[in-house]
């Protein structure tokens, strides 16, 4: 297993709709044909996995049925995108990327982004 | 159809390490999450660790020093090690399928169980 | 952790009775689970996402709640619902189960 840096934005503010988005770049060493993208969530000293997709250089990420996130791919960098988010699912994301195929096995994980979510406020009634 | 089966040790001297393997069918373990969970005899459910799709492992906080999960997905097995048990581990394993993350949309359930496995742990 | 306080641990009913046991959690939960076990078998699914019946589920059974407190009802008890059932929470790991409810002939 050989160390790749991967990089991501320290602090990213989910919309009201809870929809969070941020881009995951990792510094391929060679020509990889197939990567995996894993994130992960830590808080309360858990890590927990959102959502992983693998895909084909070249190719869009296909995440799993019912899973949260969306995903695009562009060269050496993944646009994710996590929706359905509450305050509860505030902490930090940390993208983790593994180069499958070709050998030899790649493997980085960023330092995380921390994603605030603020549950929006209800709409206050109104006569019209 | 969707199968799972435990197999394993059925007595395990104390102190030694207890391992289970968890056999799929039916399913892909890339596309869910298997789960084990324990009952000590005449007592309740007790979850022990999950193995997410993309290999990421969580463990119960009281058992996280001495668990560990890992899978081979090309032999459809997911294998679970308890090390240094005492009598308190006594317990029906078993293995279940579920969501294949800890965040999603919907399907939060564990909707096929192994038949379980009874270890004792015993000198 | 959050825990999962299931009452009442066990009860005695007739067939045809309506059952309802209730789950009450330590914080506000997102997703609750519920399970019947019989003696010797594994636990089956009865619920999940909080009120969706589980394939093969018969419709008596039904689930509730929010926040906190949740529910499942049996609407009218039939010979075979005589078993153990379990609550399970899914908001926050370690993941964690009710003490049980025990059903029981009257």
């Known amino acids: 297993c050989k160390a790749m840096h991967v990089a991501q934005p320290a602090v990213v503010l989910a919309s009201s709709r809870g929809i969070a988005s941020f881009v995951c770049e990792y510094a391929s060493p060679g020509k990889a044909t197939e990567v995996r993208v894993t994130v992960l969530r830590q808080a309360d000293s858990q890590v927990t996995e959102v959502c992983a997709a693998t895909y084909m250089m070249g190719n869009e990420l296909t995440f799993l049925d019912d899973s949260i996130c969306t995903g695009t791919s562009s060269g050496n960098q993944v646009n994710l995108t996590i929706q359905g988010l509450r305050a509860m699912d505030t902490g930090l994301y940390i993208c983790k990327v593994e180069l499958m195929y070709p050998p030899p096995y790649y493997l980085g994980i960023g330092n995380g982004t921390q994603i605030y979510v603020i549950d929006p406020e209800p709409c206050p009634d109104s006569d019209f | 159809q969707v199968q799972l089966q435990e197999s394993g040790p059925g007595l395990v001297k104390p102190s030694q390490t207890l391992s289970l393997t968890c056999t799929v069918s039916?399913?892909?373990?890339?596309?869910?999450?298997v789960y084990w969970v324990r009952q000590p005899p005449g007592k309740g459910l007790e979850w022990l660790g999950v193995?997410?799709?993309?290999?990421?492992?969580n463990y119960n906080s009281a058992l996280m020093s001495r668990l560990t999960i890992s899978k081979d997905t090309s032999k459809n097995q997911v294998s679970l090690k308890l090390s240094s048990v005492t009598a308190a581990d006594t317990a029906v394993y078993y293995c279940?399928?579920?969501?294949?993350?800890?965040?999603?949309?919907?399907?939060?359930?564990?909707?096929?169980w192994g038949q379980g496995t009874l270890v004792t742990v015993s000198s | 952790d959050i825990q999962m306080t299931q009452s009442p641990s066990s009860l005695s009913a007739s067939v045809g009775d309506r059952v309802t046991i209730t789950c009450s959690a330590t914080?506000?939960?997102?997703?609750m689970s519920w399970y019947q076990q019989k003696p010797g078998k594994a636990p089956k699914l009865l619920i999940y996402?909080?009120?969706n019946l589980a394939s093969g589920v018969p419709s008596r059974f039904s689930g509730s709640g929010s926040g906190t407190d949740y529910t499942l009802t049996i609407s009218s008890l039939q010979p075979e619902d005589f078993a153990t059932y379990y609550c399970?929470?899914?908001?926050?790991?370690?993941?964690?189960f009710g003490g049980g409810t025990k059903v029981e002939i009257k």
């Open positions: 279940a399928r579920g969501p294949p993350h800890a965040m999603m949309k919907r399907g939060y359930a564990m909707d096929y």
């Open positions: 039916g399913f892909s373990l890339t596309s869910y999450g």
């Open positions: 193995i997410w799709a993309g290999g990421t492992t």
């Open positions: 914080s506000s939960i997102t997703y």
């Open positions: 996402d909080t009120s």
């Open positions: 399970q929470q899914w908001s926050s790991y370690p993941l964690t």
